[in-house]
């Protein structure tokens, strides 16, 4: 059983969203007492994989040499020290992209869009997808997260932004993936530029802030107002 | 009945390649880790190394890393183990042996019956 | 790597007798100490793992115990049957590594 020695952290290099046939590092890292390190892999029944610590013994290294679907979904690990078994690490949730085609991102009516108007993201794919995510760069997570009812696929995932702040502007992308799996999706849609004009009196400043900064409104998720689109997709926000 | 059959002897010259393999039966082959152990005729046993099925990860002992690959077909629920640049020093029976996690512990609970490997010219 | 010494390399005991062999490493394994039987021409066996815990389907006059680098395979009561070559196994660390095994005769 797992004794109370403190959980390890865990974590990927470059990051943990990576695209098809490039390399990734998984990381453990424990104490200077680890004699094993232990990862698992959701669903596994046996350890994914298992390593002697690296000296100074706190941390084992885990390498992925170019992903693939395989390797894509929701990891944990332990270490081993003299007095047993840690407790489990958080999940690290191993994203790939490239897994289909990548879809089409717009702006309707227009990426030039006037503050305090609103606009909507249309994600488009070729082929019939269940799972829309609409990301903005530099942002730490996923804006905006649709999934369709029931299994129903779709072509495409309307994202709408109503009133439009400063705020919103900036760069996006989308994705679409299958339901069956989380953890794959598609190549990244083209970037899209929205630009914010300002004729209404913004109620908050642009943020000026670089990636090592606290976060700031682009870090929060979008909450757009209006119905949900007809398009039979329910939205999560994470 | 949970089975690991391994090939046949082989004769092999010094300097050659060989490619042993267990046949694992009676089983989800990608749920249990595969072990590959060294017996020198009248001499103890040597660890080389393991195997994960069901994504191809390897832990070698350093002394074998050079000598011993380690592989799996998924679709025939077979483990390999191919010995390189042979000499007499391998001549051997090469045993595998899965390997059963009970919680956070582990044991070897099958073996394959081993294959004899002679190296000579 | 961590040597692992078994004792005695080989030996003679009567059918009935308690015998123990005892296998030391060279550093603290922590417990994870398996022992095996071997018999002519076959494949080993395994008795026991985490240094006391029976395999389903060994007798139980076989017994393990020991902790730290000293550890210990009771047999309570030979039987014929118990003839071959034991050897311990540490997969405490990388690489696992096998004690040079004891030879048990029957007298």
């Known amino acids: 059983q797992a004794g109370p020695l403190p959980k390890p952290t865990l974590w990927a290099e470059p990051g943990s969203v990576i695209s098809w046939g490039n390399s990734v590092t998984i990381w453990c890292q424990g104490t200077l007492e680890a004699r094993e390190y232990r990862l698992d892999k959701e669903e596994s029944p046996a350890p994914w994989d298992r390593q002697n610590p690296l000296e100074p013994k706190n941390k084992a290294r885990f390498s992925i040499p170019s992903m693939t679907e395989d390797y894509a979904g929701r990891y944990r690990c332990y270490y081993r020290s003299p007095v047993g078994w840690s407790q489990p690490s958080d999940p690290l949730e191993l994203v790939m992209t490239g897994a289909y085609s990548k879809p089409t991102l717009s702006a309707l009516p227009s990426p030039l869009v006037t503050s305090g108007k609103s606009v909507t993201l249309l994600c488009q794919s070729r082929s019939p997808m269940d799972t829309f995510l609409l990301i903005k760069e530099r942002a730490a997570h996923p804006l905006l997260h649709l999934r369709s009812e029931h299994g129903a696929q779709q072509h495409q995932a309307e994202f709408p932004m109503s009133p439009v702040t400063s705020v919103h502007g900036g760069t996006y992308r989308c994705f679409s993936s299958h339901g069956f799996s989380h953890y794959l999706l598609s190549h990244p849609s083209d970037p899209l530029e929205l630009i914010v004009s300002g004729s209404l009196e913004d109620p908050r400043p642009s943020p000026t802030r670089s990636v090592s900064t606290a976060a700031g409104p682009e870090d929060q998720p979008l909450m757009p107002t209006g119905s949900v689109p007809h398009s039979g997709l329910r939205r999560h926000w994470e | 009945e949970v089975q690991l059959q391994q090939s046949g002897t082989e004769l092999v010259k010094p300097g050659a390649s060989v490619k042993l393999s267990c046949k694992a039966s009676g089983y989800t082959f990608t749920n249990y880790w595969m072990h590959w152990v060294k017996q020198r005729p009248g001499q103890g046993l040597e660890w080389i190394g393991e195997?994960?099925?069901?994504?191809?990860?390897?832990n070698y002992n350093e002394k074998f890393k050079t000598k011993a690959t380690l592989t799996v077909d998924k679709s025939s629920s077979t483990a390999y183990m191919q010995l390189s640049s042979l000499t007499s020093e391998d001549s051997a029976v090469y045993y595998c042996?899965?390997?059963?996690?009970?919680?956070?512990?582990?044991?070897?609970?099958?073996w394959g019956a081993g294959t004899t490997v002679t190296v000579s010219s | 790597d961590i040597v692992l010494t078994q004792s005695p390399s080989s030996m003679y005991a009567s059918l009935g007798e308690r015998v123990t062999i005892t296998c030391k490493a060279s550093q603290d394994i922590n417990s994870y100490l398996s022992w095996f039987q071997q018999k002519p021409g076959k494949s080993p066996k395994t008795l026991i793992y985490?240094?006391?815990r029976l395999l389903d389907g060994v007798p139980s006059r076989f017994s393990g115990g020991g902790s730290g680098q000293d550890y210990s395979l009771t047999i309570s009561s030979l039987e014929h049957e118990d003839m071959g070559i034991y050897y311990c196994?540490?997969?405490?660390?990388?690489?696992?590594?096998f004690g040079g095994g004891t030879k048990l005769e029957i007298k």
């Open positions: 195997i994960n099925p069901s994504n191809g990860r390897t």
């Open positions: 196994l540490q997969c405490d660390e990388f690489p696992h590594t």
């Open positions: 985490r240094a006391n």
């Open positions: 042996a899965r390997s059963t996690y009970y919680g956070y512990d582990w044991y070897f609970d099958v």
